[in-house]
Interface confidence: low
């Protein structure tokens, strides 16, 4: 079988949800000594970076200006050391936001509930869209989808303190083009005192940790390069 290098890690710096006309930055973290990194969009090559000097940096950044719906979609990256190519990274979905209109988010029975109560969020947007998305701040990768012509429901079932937090919703014009975010709705869940420690569904790391951890090599880093790669995959 054809030998390949371990796959790189692709990340969006700060967030994968980029407001239209703003700049997105994607990072591809590969390996010290990589002489070339390629960014692919929807399966096609779009950009090439060649770090200088290659042995001193373990990844590159790709800057994408002026975000719009044509640039939103699935990105991946690969890298090369000598003549040997890596496997392709996982796919990263880059989303453009602030398209068209702003939805309204409400919660029933209200923003303050007791543990065990059933809660439903409602996201409403009057312009033509059929898909709605609900995100909890700090958990933007956990997107709940719901469908409806003008309004969508997001039933949460019986809530626990793990559901506490601020929520926003978006209308979606396709998988990668979202509306402006709604105003946040803060859900306060009281009770269930013995269960207020971190629940498994809570984020261990906030979104702001989703940054580009590219490092310049020192002697110590060279020894830790393999561990760094393994640790990053474990974190994912």
């Amino acid at each position: 079988p054809k030998q390949t290098l371990p796959k790189p890690i692709i990340r969006a710096e700060s967030t994968y949800m980029v407001p239209k006309e703003k700049q997105a930055t994607l990072c591809c973290q590969g390996s010290y000594g990589a002489v070339e990194y390629q960014l692919h969009f929807e399966g096609s090559l779009f950009a090439v970076e060649r770090p200088k000097p290659p042995e001193r940096i373990n990844g590159v950044k790709f800057h994408i200006p002026d975000m719009n719906s044509r640039k939103a979609g699935r990105y991946s990256c690969i890298y090369r050391v000598g003549e040997l190519w890596s496997e392709r990274s996982d796919l990263l979905d880059l989303v453009v936001t602030e398209m068209y209109d702003t939805p309204t988010l409400s919660v029933h029975p209200g923003p303050e509930v007791t543990s065990g109560e059933k809660v439903t969020f409602y996201c409403r947007l009057d312009t033509a869209t059929s898909m709605f998305l609900l995100l909890k701040e700090g958990r933007s990768r956990d997107v709940q989808r719901s469908y409806g012509k003008v309004q969508a429901e997001f039933p949460m079932g019986p809530v626990t303190t793990a559901h506490r937090g601020s929520y926003r919703c978006f209308g979606s014009y396709n998988n990668y083009a979202w509306s402006f975010p709604s105003e946040p709705v803060k859900l306060l869940v009281t009770g269930d005192i013995e269960n207020t420690s971190l629940a498994p569904t809570d984020p261990t790391f906030p979104d702001s940790w989703d940054t580009c951890l590219l490092t310049r090599e020192t002697g110590l880093q060279k020894d830790l390069a393999l561990w760094d790669h393994t640790a990053q995959n474990l974190l994912r």
């Epitope: 930055t25 090559l45 060649r50 994408i64 002026d66």
Partner: antibody, heavy 125, light 107 residues
Framework: QVQLVQSGGGLVKPGGSLRLSCAAS????????MSWIRQAPGKGLEWVGF??????????EYAASVKGRFTISRDNSKNTLYLQMNSLRAEDTALYYC????????????????WGQGTLVTVSS | DIQMTQSPSSLSASVGDRVTITCRAS??????LAWYQQKPGKAPKLLIY???RLESGVPSRFSGSGSGTDFTLTISSLQPEDFATYYC?????????FGQGTKVEIK
């Protein structure tokens, strides 16, 4: 809409200097690579050089044929690109275009989605 | 530098014809290739980038294909406004380089 409006061409003697300008509008100028491309009369397109976006440090690259004689600069506050041409030669005679590098310029290359109208530079004694 | 070679250098065709222009790179460039159309006295216009992606606003009769070193621009049904010179350009590495052009003339 995106517009690139060029100025500054003309007739110049061999060894002389000339500065071309390209005024940009309709997009966030500092976010984009900007390039100069030339076309000698009746000939094909030849890349002259580019200046990278602010995110890539605003650094420049030049074709071997102009390196050391031509300088590309940009003023992001004025949304303007410049090409300073010194030690001009007869073979520099061409129509010069400024062009915007498209969205996926990397540190290595670009394609060009918007072009200026071109400005003629004639080097002759 | 990567050399780009276009063929043919010129061709004569009639309205409605299917026209194919080829471009060959001196080394592999993946799918990092763009095509431009230039009419006399005008600036070039981007038609296709990344070998096969149609630039916004370009008619669907234009299509591109290829990867590695060999690329093709096809006009499925030539229209009067398509008589022009076409250039390929690699956007794989610096310096970006252009083919010498293919002039499409009326038969």
């Amino acid at each position: 809409q995106v517009q690139l409006v060029q100025s500054g061409g003309g007739l110049v003697k061999p060894g002389g200097s000339l500065r071309l300008s390209c005024a940009a509008s309709g997009f966030t100028f500092s976010d984009y690579y900007m390039s100069w491309i030339r076309q000698a009369p009746g000939k094909g397109l030849e890349w002259v050089g580019f200046i990278r976006s602010e995110a890539y440090g605003g650094t420049t690259e030049y074709a071997a044929s102009v390196k050391g004689r031509f300088t590309i600069s940009r003023d992001n506050s004025k949304n303007t690109l410049y090409l300073q041409m010194n030690s001009l030669r007869a073979e520099d005679t061409a129509l010069y275009y400024c062009a915007r590098g498209d969205r996926y310029c990397s540190s290595t290359s670009c394609w060009f989605d918007y072009w200026g109208q071109g400005t003629l530079v004639t080097v002759s004694s | 530098d990567i050399q780009m070679t276009q063929s043919p250098s010129s061709l004569s065709a009639s309205v409605g014809d299917r026209v194919t222009i080829t471009c060959r790179a001196s080394q592999g460039i993946s799918n990092a290739l763009a095509w431009y159309q230039q009419k006399p006295g005008k600036a070039p216009k981007l038609l296709i980038y990344a070998a096969s992606r149609l630039e916004s606003g370009v008619p669907s009769r234009f299509s591109g294909s290829g990867s590695g070193t060999d690329f093709t621009l096809t006009i499925s049904s030539l229209q009067p406004e398509d008589f022009a010179t076409y250039y390929c350009q690699q956007h794989y590495s610096t310096p970006p380089t252009f083919g010498q052009g293919t002039k499409v003339e009326i038969k």
